[in-house]
């Protein structure tokens, strides 16, 4: 298991990456004033303890910005956020921090992020560009929840 | 109101199991953990182990593995406890206590009431 | 197994600063042992404190501060009232598994 977080670049397939705006992480497409966020993800070290069918368990977090991706309910809605949260914190905790947790699903080159604290919601982009990343239950409609990791370093 | 509620005072005989009882109102057990610990007369605290009822995986201390089971049934937001081959050693007050995350760290913050074991011929 | 050791007793007076402490016999207590802090009133009544060395859930009087002196988890008490006579106990994180201390039994005169 790895004890260090392995940044990565992110993209959907329609070649748009993330962007932090205001605090908020948005998808746009990849241009040369662009610069994307690198990721930072880390295997939660309890796997033993999650559901071992859906995929790898994952704190994805903001490299060297202190913000990690979470879930949390608005009403009665999940909703994704970024909280100030150092990724290492989250790792070494005595029990997987589900509400930061996502399964991460790889078919092929694509990947999935599905919230651990919220099952069957997905990370998501809208099929707009230029929109927040949000939390869906409906795969492969209006949002796209398919992804490319690139490993950076 | 957050509450853990817990089973009453058992007399066992050595040998036997027994089956704890910890009904949570006020939260959903589904949100959180569910940790059990074991007070001896005049002694400190000691870690059995924790379930997790989303998905019923349990972790022990390991001089716990084999003599104590966790489950959870989330649809009466109960929690149990059950210890077998029962001895003296086993005469103890056992507590529930819920392990959950506030957004900056996990706290032991709602405990039961305690369900006191005497095992005893 | 590691043990955890606090202090058997302390007195102190209302309006008075107390600290207790929680000793690790396997070296220097560290934020990676995410010390939890209980109180316990007579008729087995517990309550969460402190978790994750220093962090206080809702519904915790400000006066109850957890931190780490030198190498050992402190619970620091500001200005003790006589409700705060109790027993408490520290539990501290090791990888795998909790480990309580032995507990602390506070009085208030």
């Known amino acids: 298991k790895s004890e260090m977080p392995q940044p990565v670049s992110i993209q959907d397939i329609n070649h748009r990456v993330w962007v932090l705006q205001d605090q908020i992480l948005i998808a746009v497409p990849r241009k040369d004033r662009v610069s994307p966020v690198t990721i930072s993800l880390i295997s939660c070290r309890h796997v033993e303890t999650l559901e071992k069918d859906r995929g790898n368990p994952i704190y994805l977090g903001l490299n060297g910005l202190n913000l990690c991706l979470m879930c949390a309910k608005a009403g009665d809605q999940p909703t994704l956020q970024l909280k100030e949260k150092d990724i290492m914190d989250l790792y070494n905790q005595p029990e997987p921090v589900k509400s930061f947790l996502f399964y991460h699903s790889q078919s092929g080159r694509n990947s999935t992020f599905e919230s651990v604290a919220f099952p069957g919601w997905f990370i998501a982009v809208s099929s707009e560009g230029g929109c927040p990343l949000i939390l869906t239950q409906e795969l492969g409609k209006a949002n796209t929840t398919d992804f490319g990791l690139t490993m950076l370093f | 109101e957050v509450q853990l509620q817990q089973s009453g005072a058992e007399l066992v005989k050595p040998g036997a199991s027994v089956k704890l009882t910890c009904t949570a109102s006020g939260f959903n057990i589904k949100d959180t953990y569910i940790y059990w610990v074991k007070q001896r007369p005049a002694q400190g605290l000691e870690w059995i182990g924790r379930i997790d009822p989303a998905n019923a995986y349990t972790k022990f201390d390991p001089k716990f593995q084999g003599k104590a089971t966790l489950t959870a049934d989330t649809s009466s937001n109960t929690a149990y406890l059950q210890l077998s081959s029962l001895t003296s050693e086993d005469t103890a007050v056992y507590y529930c206590?819920?392990?959950?995350?506030?957004?900056?760290?996990?706290?032991?913050?709602?405990w039961g009431q305690g369900t006191t074991l005497t095992v005893s011929s | 197994q590691a043990v955890v050791t606090q202090e058997s007793a302390l007195t102190t007076s209302p309006g008075e600063t107390v600290t207790l402490t929680c000793r690790s016999s396997t070296g220097a207590v560290t934020t990676s042992n995410y010390a939890n802090w209980v109180q316990e009133k007579p008729d087995h009544l517990f309550t969460g404190l402190i978790g994750g060395t220093d962090n206080r859930p809702p519904g915790v009087p400000a006066r109850f501060s957890g931190s780490l002196i030198g190498d050992k988890a402190a619970l620091t008490i500001t200005g003790a009232q006589t409700e705060d006579e109790a027993i408490y106990f520290c539990?501290?994180?090791?990888?795998?598994?909790?480990?309580f201390g032995g507990g602390t039994k506070l009085t208030v005169l």
């Open positions: 206590t819920r392990f959950h995350w506030y957004g900056s760290s996990f706290f032991f913050d709602y």
């Open positions: 539990a501290l994180w090791y990888s795998n598994l909790w480990v």
